[in-house]
Amino acid sequence: IWELKKDVYVVELDWYPDAPGEMVVLTCDTPEEDGITWTLDQSSEVLGSGKTLTIQVKEFGDAGQYTCHKGGEVLSHSLLLLHKKEDGIWSTDILKDQKEPKNKTFLRCEAKNYSGRFTCWWLTTISTDLTFSVKSSRGSSDPQGVTCGAATLSAERVRGDNKEYEYSVECQEDSACPAAEESLPIEVMVDAVHKLKYENYTSSFFIRDIIKPDPPKNLQLKPLKNSRQVEVSWEYPDTWSTPHSYFSLTFCVQVQGKSKREKKDRVFTDKTSATVICRKNASISVRAQDRYYSSSWSEWASVPCS
Amino acid sequence: RAVPGGSSPAWTQCQQLSQKLCTLAWSAHPLVGHMDLREEGDEETTNDVPHIQCGDGCDPQGLRDNSQFCLQRIHQGLIFYEKLLGSDIFTGEPSLLPDSPVGQLHASLLGLSQLLQPEGHHWETQQIPSLSPSQPWQRLLLRFKILRSLQAFVAVAARVFAHGAATLSP
């Protein structure tokens, strides 16, 4: 058993049929010694008396808010949550496995640049009695500070018969060093509580591996005289790290016909312009990637050919 | 050439070679063998490798003030990785394919380090760590981890040389 926060405790249980459970001793936070009784949740049934209460925690029915009273007055509360371990593996019932980039990916994170700011998100089908708390650090043995905001509900989607809820959080490394080569990963830890179930999820990454630039901006076409060719030009996204001579991007320019089946013409360039043939009803798209480190490509920025 | 005394390196040559190194490091990575282990090998093998850290002067401001600190750190890393790529980790079982980009990568690391340090000048280099793989699967794991770490290192080096070529070239 360990304390999650003041008066909230997590009991770790091996979860299998007829498991013995854990013996837990609760102590009433009071100078009083006599006449103390204990109840669970809204029930008025007295579970025991005395300053301490010993219980065998085996199932969710044994978890909840234990309250000690004296003469009708509440002295203190202890909320017990359960953390299930099945066959040596902690349960992951609350969050959905996003399966990208690999199985057992519950938290996904992205950064738009090297400033030390990043966003993480996760999915659940649970709509009520759900709380999240997020902590983060750079490294784990001698952790350096990362400040995270509160997790918020950022999207709701219908998936078949189910509703899916997306939560996200923004974090910022306290003393980021954009130009350095990271040697210690960022650690993100999410505590999830649904009713009386506790679970924790972690992700470990380098900012360089979660970089996804915003799409190029100001995408423009300039027809070339007496030719089907056009000059496409664009600019670095505002959110990308500066100076651009140091934090350089590379670009992919694509000409795509109306039909998805049509052959795509692609050009790769380090410049912020390219010359391509503009076909009728086609569109021109450009996306960006870090020039020196193969993290994610940005989404496409697009303009019609006409 | 980056003479330890303080003259400028051939920024444009260094830029071209460091960008080639980036490409080679990424093309070598998937080719050192099928690898599920990399998904689970969570402990850092690379704590002993020379990283380009915050105080090494490799940021744009630091390069403007005095690029020598940064160039020395890059040189140190290049020599270090060159030694690792020539060690038993890459030469032992399982054998790399004859056309593996690791050979080219090894040669290019040496090439860039020589551009930075002409004959007769010596910056101190870091000892190669004893990673002591005794099994082929351990070598394979280390190859992945070393190449991942090298990708990060050469990315910073390439940024340095690109910025130098754009802003510090005579």
């Epitope: - | 282990l37 079982e93 794991l141």
Partner: antibody
Framework: EVTLKESGPVLVKPTETLTLTCTVS????????ISWIRQPPGKALEWLGV???????NYNSGIKSRLTISKDTSKSQVVLTMTNMDPVDTATYYC???????????????WGQGTTVTVSS | DIVLTQSPDSLAVSLGERATINCRAS??????????MHWFQQKPGQPPKLLIY???NLESGIPDRFSGSGSRTDFTLTISSLQAEDVAVYYC?????????FGGGTKVEIK
């Protein structure tokens, strides 16, 4: 289908040399390592040695001086030679494939049926 | 050499009940976060069969009532609901250092 089959004498006299051959099919010896493992009657398993994809070998130091493992990749055969046999070497000898280096980390994914060798005069 | 000690030596469990076998190594069998510990099942007159590799990965074709956990020196094989066909001897094996070594085996029977 992956198969490994051990062949060789079932009876060997003390001080003689044992030669066992492992013939494999369904995979190439240039892609997978082969280990030899033995199991005395009613006892646990003992690893004897391995021949790697590139032809290098490692042996159990306890019996290293008596062991040689070699292979002929084109014939898909691995040969175990063990000199100076003794009654305590009576065991079932297995030829075993070590799983893909990058996934299995030294786990042995396919085993031959084993050949029982008795050392007796 | 790395010594692997299995416990218990034998285990009698009722059908449908849980069976747990432990394997303790004399030194860590982890290499940079990878546990080179594997579990095998051997039935009489048959060669051993790989069940679990790298401590917790289920070999293809093995029922998911088998699971493995642990790291460094302490490892566990669990059969969540014992079936009649699970009666066998179970061995752990490490491949972190030469020589590869096996545990002494745990015999699982039906109560």
């Amino acid at each position: 289908e992956v198969t490994l089959k051990e062949s060789g004498p079932v009876l060997v006299k003390p001080t003689e040399t044992l030669t066992l051959t492992c013939t494999v099919s369904g995979f190439s010896l240039s892609s997978y390592a082969i280990s030899w493992i033995r199991q005395p009657p009613g006892k646990a398993l003992e690893w004897l040695g391995v021949i790697w994809t590139g032809g290098g070998t490692n042996y159990n130091s306890g019996i290293k001086s008596r062991l040689t493992i070699s292979k002929d990749t084109s014939k898909s055969q691995v040969v175990l030679t063990m000199t100076n046999m003794d009654p305590v070497d009576t065991a079932t000898y297995y030829c075993v494939r070590e799983g893909d280096y990058g996934s299995y980390a030294g786990a042995m994914d396919y085993w031959g049926q084993g050949t029982t060798v008795t050392v007796s005069s | 050499d790395i010594v692997l000690t299995q416990s218990p030596d034998s285990l009698a469990v009722s059908l449908g009940e849980r069976a747990t076998i432990n394997c303790r190594a004399s030194e860590s069998v982890d290499y940079y976060g990878i546990s080179s510990m594997h579990w095998f099942q051997q039935k009489p007159g048959q060669p051993p069969k790989l069940l679990i590799y790298r401590a917790s990965n289920l070999e293809s074709g093995i029922p998911d009532r088998f699971s493995g956990s642990g790291s460094r020196t302490d490892f566990t094989l669990t059969i969540s609901s014992l079936q009649a066909e699970d009666v066998a001897v179970y061995y752990c094996q490490q491949a972190n250092k030469d020589p590869y070594t096996f545990g002494g085996g745990t015999k699982v029977e039906i109560k």
